[in-house]
């Protein structure tokens, strides 16, 4: 319902709001931590930009029914057409309880349009527990709060993100279902905007309690590699970042934000097909520990280090770096023990305003994209979108560590 | 400043018809969805309908769908609400207003409330 | 379509006391609320989007709460400038609805 800049994205055929009607795997397990970069040279699956390029292992048959990927916080099963487990992972909209499913009229009837929802239970997004998310006509979810248009980018779960436009047809509707312990998007018998023609998609993204992702594709008319992707990405997995306030060397009253993805799975679209599905299933991080024992003595992937200041164990790389870099945790932790802590009130903390935003693990990481842009009062009210599809390119896998200055 | 200017409204008999424009200034027009709202005398407020920013979708009201038109020149930044069959009961001060939008990435954007509204124009039906 | 109620239809307050007001849809709307205020003669004036959040230049004495299907509009203590007619509307779903709105009148 609102503007949608670009002029041309949004067009479909007459009134394009009329109303609708209702409606096992085995392990290839490698410890990473960010920069390691496994076998580049074998079939790729997906890119982690976590972990770099993760390879691609078939069965001893060399069939790719299921296939089974680590990424430091998920562990991806790829489930073909031909496994029984993809038709379980579907879930039927239809057959669930009447008064838990939506058909969202907004988002069913319009383009580049999105809805926030708030969820009925947490769920944790690489350890983030999170209970608003935003569902993007597009085919993919925005998962956490704006706080700047660009982080929208780099915060995602996206079964297939690409330019589907419930608008063009009568029978596209965008549904979801919220029972509690699941949550369920499903975009049913969208179009792609200007290939029309080529059919109708229907696929899910579900977010389980438990913090399991799972992507289920119905209807997939055509191969997802030949989608343009000129006008909108096309993005199959999921991404988080952070953003972090820093002073501008320019402007010495104001901060430059620097938005920061820490990670990213994006799996090979030429295997989201008809009946395949893909589940995510999320793997400990620093965050689950409650106390400083349970942190300091994980047996994780990341380096995970107690902040006594904010009673929070961290690996420096989650959603809130800003605090752990403002209150000086990652100064705090080196080489101390929980017993050094012990005595020490936490509760008078405040934030250490000289203390550098760019200490340490953050630049040694090779694998990152940084965002920069002036602090504006308040700039996603306002409207900074150029056309076309931005600043996409800067999105590539292949962008590590440049920034990008949006001027605003 | 940014402002809504609309005018057009009138006395008008019952199945005529009235032409509503909305003039805007201020503000990049083309960016924006508009909406029209109206108010009966006396009574609350009814969303009529909205426009998206290039013209292309539109979405009514059940009350005069089939009735009404909404449009928009953005080379003129106008809005126009083109009433048909008029009755009695569409008799109302009309609003046009600016759909307050938050960008995210991609050109996606989320409705959040009417943010500039124009002071109104009254139409009246009667014979 | 999602129906939107108010209550009470009339608030007769003290200026300097505080006023609630009550906001209640049929179906789930999220936070996906606003708040207007509406001064005879005048347009409505957008006070609150997102169920909680202040428009620009609106004054810290208003604030929102709720989610899902009960919201509530607080004035923190009334002046004489907020005696007014307050709506909600939920533009989570189309048609977009309003309440039959609270009439803040002085006591």
């Known amino acids: 319902l609102s503007p949608q800049p670009g002029a041309g994205h949004d067009e479909g055929p007459g009134s394009g709001w009329a109303a609708k009607g209702t409606v096992r795997g085995w392990n290839r397990r490698a410890r990473e931590s960010p920069g390691h970069v496994s076998e580049p040279d074998r079939t790729q699956l997906s890119q982690d930009l976590g972990g770099g390029t993760l390879a691609m292992d078939t069965l001893p048959d060399n069939r790719t029914r299921v296939v089974e990927d680590n990424h430091s916080y998920y562990v991806s099963r790829l489930y073909g057409p031909s496994e029984p487990h993809s038709r379980e992972l579907w879930v039927d909209v239809a057959e669930a309880n009447r008064s838990q499913v939506k058909i969202h009229t907004i988002l069913s009837n319009t383009h580049r349009q999105a809805s926030r929802v708030v969820l009925s239970f947490d769920f944790p997004f690489y350890g983030h527990p999170l209970r608003q998310i935003t569902i993007a006509t597009g085919g993919f979810i925005f998962m956490g709060d704006v706080i700047h248009r660009m982080l929208t980018a780099t915060q995602y779960v996206a079964p297939l993100m690409a330019n589907f436009n419930p608008g063009y047809s009568d029978n596209s509707t965008v549904v979801y279902f919220d029972n509690g312990t699941v949550f369920v998007v499903q975009w049913d018998h969208v179009y792609l905007q200007g290939w029309e023609d080529k059919g109708s998609f229907t696929f899910q993204a579900a977010l389980h309690h438990d913090g399991r992702i799972v992507f289920a594709y119905k209807e997939i008319p055509m191969s997802v590699p030949e989608i343009s992707s000129s006008q909108h990405p096309v993005k199959t997995g999921l991404s988080d970042a952070f953003m972090i306030l820093n002073p501008s060397p320019d402007v010495p009253e104001s901060r430059r934000r620097s938005i920061f993805e820490y990670h990213r799975i994006e799996l090979d679209p030429s295997k989201v097909t008809s009946m395949s599905a893909v589940e995510f299933t999320p793997l400990p991080t620093c965050l689950q520990h409650r106390s400083c024992d349970a942190c300091m003595s994980s047996d994780l992937t990341f380096n995970c280090s107690w902040c006594h200041v904010l009673q929070r164990c961290s690996s420096g790389f989650d959603r809130y770096r800003q605090e752990w870099m403002d209150y000086g945790c990652a100064q705090e932790a080196e080489g101390r023990m929980c017993e050094d802590f012990q005595d020490e009130d936490h509760d008078s903390a405040s934030p250490d305003t000289s203390f550098s935003p760019y200490d340490g693990d953050l630049t040694t990481t090779s694998s990152s994209l940084f965002i920069d842009s002036l602090t504006t009062e308040d700039d996603t009210k306002l409207n900074p979108y150029a056309g076309g599809d931005g600043l996409q390119n800067n999105l590539s896998p292949k962008t590590k560590g440049t920034p990008v200055h949006l001027g605003t | 400043q940014v402002q809504l200017v609309e005018s057009g409204g009138g006395v008008v008999q019952p199945g005529r018809s009235l032409r509503l424009s909305c003039a805007a200034s201020?503000?990049?027009?083309?960016?924006?969805?508009m909406h029209w709202v109206r108010q009966a005398p006396g009574k609350g407020l009814e969303w009529v309908a909205v426009?998206?920013?290039?013209?292309?979708?539109?979405y009514y009201a059940d009350s005069v769908k089939g009735r009404f038109t909404i449009s928009r020149d953005n080379s003129k930044n106008t809005l126009y609400l083109q009433m048909n069959s008029l009755r009695a009961e569409d008799t109302a001060v009309y609003y046009c207003?600016?759909?307050?939008?938050?960008?995210?990435?991609?050109?996606?954007?989320?409705?959040?409330?009417?943010?500039?509204w124009g002071q109104g124009t009254l139409v009246t039906v009667s014979s | 379509e999602i129906v939107m109620t108010q209550s009470p239809a009339t608030l007769s307050v003290s200026p300097g006391e505080r006023a609630t007001l009550s906001c209640r849809a049929s179906?789930?709307?999220?936070?996906?609320l606003a708040w207007y205020q509406q001064k005879p003669g005048q347009a409505p004036r957008l006070l609150i989007y997102?169920?909680?959040t202040r428009a620009t230049g609106i004054p810290a004495r208003f604030s929102g709460s709720g989610s899902g299907t009960e919201f509530t509009l607080t004035i923190s203590s009334l002046q004489s400038e907020d005696f007014a007619v307050y709506y909600c509307?939920?533009?989570?779903?189309?048609?977009?609805?309003f309440g039959q709105g609270t009439k803040v009148e002085i006591k």
């Open positions: 509307q939920q533009y989570n779903d189309l048609p977009l609805t």
């Open positions: 997102g169920a909680s």
């Open positions: 207003a600016r759909d307050r939008s938050v960008y995210l990435y991609y050109g996606y954007h989320y409705y959040e409330g009417f943010d500039v």
């Open positions: 201020g503000f990049i027009f083309s960016d924006y969805d």
């Open positions: 179906q789930s709307v999220y936070n996906n």
């Open positions: 426009i998206s920013h290039s013209g292309s979708n539109k």
